[in-house]
């Protein structure tokens, strides 16, 4: 949502956050702003302090409950407000009618792990973390590895396109130190996008036998 | 029905203090703000700053920084606005008025009937 | 500090005619979340001031729809389409877009 010069984005993580971001141009005085959350169904309202992220931008974290209580359904709308200190009052500087299973970012996988790895080939499994069981299988997964002197962003992506919790990485170096991360996306939500990437997990193909093709 | 009912006219000396009252009803007083305007004698209207009942917080106009106090007691919804070392300038007919603590709308929207205070030698 | 300039300082009508009251402020008073909080208010003789018109153009509730306001950036106008005795008593402009608000200096409205 946009009012004035100012972007209000919002993700909810299909469980128990709402995660914020406000830009403003022209950057305000030393001044405390929130964002509100407001349910149209719920008895419950919540608040967080916006904080800086950068010169014109600032972000926090709407914690709605426990991290794994399902906290809205497909069919709550939030009003989400920005509102900033001015005197003694609060003015409105953002809002926004927040359909929550329509901006989904779930949170990065965790727990990666080599089950196995060889001289080509290194199995990775991974969990999902505070993801609704309202999904049921209708996630998918995003993958890249990084191989030594190249970048993230020169990584090839590869797309699980269904609940699948594990990759099977093929054409590896022998005795190589490679790097994994993967991120996840529900396939539901006009406005859903993917989760942060998971922490780099770390592994080292197994060097060739000597006198022997693996 | 939401009222504002302000404290009886006061005649000051120049140097001196006055305190004017503002008792609210109507309406939960620690739920807006409480803005404070003057008008001095023929002339336009001044805000002052204003109080917010809930926390007491308060912002006062640079104007009068230094001399103006807004103050609330709860228990009776009622909020006080002191200005000390009155000087002739200072008299006026002072509001009190009502205002929503998130300022969406509007800054004002209701009025207690002013008090008149005169500061003479 | 925002000044605000009105004029005319008096304007005397003829009931049942219009009245036209112009208000400039001395800079932008768009707030920077879009809105414009300029307010007009009512003080009949003896009287409070009355809250008329909220953000440029809304009028508060109980406000007969004789009173419009328009207006933006930093030239704004309150009208009354139809002039009647209950009208007569002196107008303020008000912005609450930056700190401190400030008031217009008033326009008196009398009958002719």
């Known amino acids: 949502a946009v009012n004035g010069t100012s972007q209000f984005t919002c993700f909810y993580n299909s469980r128990a956050n709402i995660s914020c971001v406000w830009s403003q141009d022209g950057a305000l005085q030393d001044t405390s702003c929130q964002v509100h959350a407001w349910p149209d169904r719920r008895r419950w309202n919540q608040t967080c302090e916006l904080l800086p992220v950068s010169q014109a931008s600032w972000a926090c974290n709407l914690i709605l409950g426990a991290p794994d209580s399902q906290k809205l359904t497909t069919v709550d709308i939030v009003t989400l407000r920005v509102l900033c200190r001015e005197g003694v009052r609060w003015r409105v500087m953002a809002i926004q009618d927040f359909k929550p299973f329509e901006n989904l970012r779930l949170m990065a996988p965790i727990s990666l792990q080599v089950v196995h790895v060889e001289t080509h080939r290194c199995n990775i499994s991974w969990e999902i973390s505070q993801a609704s069981h309202y999904f049921e299988r209708h996630l998918e997964f995003e993958a890249r590895t990084l191989s030594p002197g190249h970048t993230w962003e020169e990584a090839p992506l590869l797309t699980l396109k269904q609940k699948q919790e594990w990759i099977c990485l093929e054409t590896l170096t022998p005795d190589t130190q490679y790097e994994f991360q993967v991120r996840v996306k529900p396939l539901q939500g006009e406005f859903t996008t993917w989760s942060p990437w998971s922490q780099p997990l770390a592994f080292r193909t197994k060097p060739a036998a000597l006198g022997k093709d693996t | 029905e939401v009222q504002l009912v302000q404290s009886g006219a006061e005649v000051k000396k120049p140097g001196a203090s006055v305190k004017v009252s503002c008792k609210a009803s109507?309406?939960?007083?620690?739920?807006?703000?409480i803005s404070w305007v003057r008008q001095a004698t023929g002339q336009g209207l001044e805000w002052m700053g204003e109080?917010?009942?809930?926390?007491?917080?308060?912002y006062y106009n640079e104007m009068f920084k230094g001399r103006v106090t807004m103050t609330r007691d709860t228990s009776i919804s009622t909020a006080y606005m002191e200005l000390s070392s009155l000087r002739s300038e200072d008299t006026a007919v002072y509001y009190c008025?009502?205002?929503?603590?998130?300022?969406?709308?509007?800054?004002?929207?209701?009025w207690g009937q002013g008090t008149t205070v005169t500061v003479s030698s | 500090d925002v000044v605000m300039t009105q004029t005319p300082l008096s304007l005397p009508v003829t009931l049942g005619q219009p009245a036209s009251i112009s208000c400039r402020s001395s800079q932008n008073i768009v707030h920077s979340n879009g809105n414009t909080y300029l307010e007009w208010y009512q003080q009949r003789p003896g009287q409070s001031p009355r809250l008329l018109i909220y953000k440029v153009s809304n009028r508060f509730s109980g406000v007969p729809d004789r009173f419009s306001g328009s207006g933006s950036g930093t030239d704004f106008t309150l009208k009354i389409s139809r002039v009647e005795a209950e009208d007569v008593g002196v107008y303020y402009c008000?912005?609450?877009?930056?700190?401190?608000?400030?008031f217009g200096g008033g326009t008196k409205v009398e009958i002719k």
């Open positions: 109507g309406y939960t007083f620690t739920d807006y703000v």
């Open positions: 008025a009502r205002g929503s603590y998130t300022y969406d709308n509007y800054a004002m929207d209701f």
């Open positions: 109080i917010y009942p809930g926390d007491g917080n308060t």
């Open positions: 008000f912005q609450g877009s930056h700190i401190p608000w400030t």
